[in-house]
């Protein structure tokens, strides 16, 4: 009866049709499962835990970017439940490679110990 329901649809026994799973709001993630025709009885949305964020819909909460620890950059905007953190300039003692394509996380800062001579962030 419901084998053709989509990824985010459950089969509504009252209407005989596939129906959208209730999407979560920003700062929330799905609790239990819904999709491909079935919906857990207690399916719903729960707030993102600390250090995580979600734009809503059906996505799970993701960890904020670790600007200082991973990217060795300053924190421009700390993340909240609805938004990722935004990283700013490199921390002291680190520099950003020029003309380097961003990776999927953004720019990564490198230690001045590895810098070419006269790199401006590393001078002085």
């Amino acid at each position: 009866e419901y084998s053709n329901c989509g990824e985010n649809e459950y089969y509504n026994q009252t209407t005989g049709l596939c129906q959208e799973c209730p999407p979560c709001g920003p700062g929330e993630e799905p609790y239990l499962s819904c999709g491909y025709g079935t919906k857990d009885e207690d399916y719903g949305c729960v707030p993102c835990p600390a250090e995580k964020f979600s734009k809503g819909g059906y996505q799970i909460c993701r960890r904020h970017k670790d600007c200082e620890g991973f990217f060795r950059a300053t924190v421009l905007t700390p993340g909240d439940m609805e938004n990722d953190a935004e990283c700013g300039p490199c921390l002291p003692g680190y520099y950003m490679l020029e003309n380097r394509p961003r990776n999927i996380y953004g720019m990564v800062c490198y230690s001045c110990l590895l810098a070419p001579p006269n790199t401006k962030e590393c001078v002085g």
């Epitope: 009866e1 009252t14 209407t15 005989g16 959208e20």
Partner: antibody
Framework: EVQLKKSGPELVKPGASVKMSCKAS????????MHWVKQSHGKSLEWIGY????????SNNQRFKGKATLTADKSSSTAYIQLNSLTSEDSAFYYC??????????????WGAGTTVTVSS | DIVMTQSPLSLPVSLGDQASISCRSS???????????LHWYLQKPGQSPNLLIY???NRFSGVPDRFSGSGSGTDFTLKISRVEAEDLGVYFC?????????FGAGTKLELK
């Protein structure tokens, strides 16, 4: 009297998009799902999908995912279907249809007159 | 998707004749709730389809009693006891036990 009033015929070029409307009257627009059905010339009927005007939730036949976008405007009791990237295969009559689901009776009880779409360069 | 196969595709009749149209589904149309969602629609020339029979054998409001539906599982029949001029057109069977709803190819009831 329950009525579904269609928009006028459409002549569109291949690759273009078209948006058709269906204005409901004589009943509570948000109390029924609105479905869309395609009838190619001289052929059978094909279910496209539906929208629940109460909350805007939609579900499409897998065959029409990416082809048809369904929307509704509660304030004017009007449902819309937009078809994009049109080809000659999309030339057809398009019906809006009210869906009844009371007491486990599930059927299409009121059909609009059908909008003709012709895709031609 | 469920395939609905109608026969015949064309049915020439004289007014007053009995007419019978068959519809077969590729899977059983008995829903887990016990109902069978097999319906019949009539599309008169130049018009939209209209519901005639719902759930195998229930006549929709305003439908004359010369129309009757029967069948179960995968095999269904629509009968018109005495064909009148206003009955001419294309008859479609349809199911919505399974998603997505599907329709037969249609049977054209026409005068001999």
């Amino acid at each position: 009297e329950v009525q579904l009033k269609k928009s006028g015929p459409e002549l569109v070029k291949p690759g273009a998009s078209v948006k058709m409307s269906c204005k409901a009257s004589g009943y509570s627009f948000t109390g029924y799902n609105m479905h869309w059905v395609k009838q190619s010339h001289g052929k059978s009927l094909e279910w496209i999908g539906y929208i629940d005007p109460y909350n805007g939730a939609t579900s499409n036949n897998q065959r029409f995912k990416g082809k048809a976008t369904l929307t509704a405007d509660k304030s004017s009791s009007t449902a819309y279907i937009q078809l994009n990237s049109l080809t000659s295969e999309d030339s057809a009559f398009y019906y809006c249809v009210r869906y009844y689901y009371g007491d486990y009776h599930w059927y299409f009880d009121v059909w609009g007159a059908g909008t003709t779409v012709t895709v031609s360069s | 998707d469920i395939v609905m196969t109608q026969s015949p595709l064309s049915l020439p009749v004289s007014l007053g004749d009995q007419a019978s149209i068959s519809c077969r589904s590729s899977q059983s149309l008995v829903h887990s709730n016990g109902n069978t969602y097999l319906h019949w629609y009539l599309q008169k020339p130049g018009q939209s389809p209209n519901l005639l029979i719902y759930k195998v054998s229930n006549r929709f409001s305003g439908v004359p009693d010369r129309f009757s539906g029967s069948g179960s599982g995968t095999d269904f029949t629509l009968k018109i006891s005495r064909v009148e001029a206003e009955d001419l057109g294309v008859y479609f069977c349809s199911q919505n036990t399974h998603v997505p709803p599907t329709f037969g190819a249609g049977t054209k009831l026409e005068l001999k």
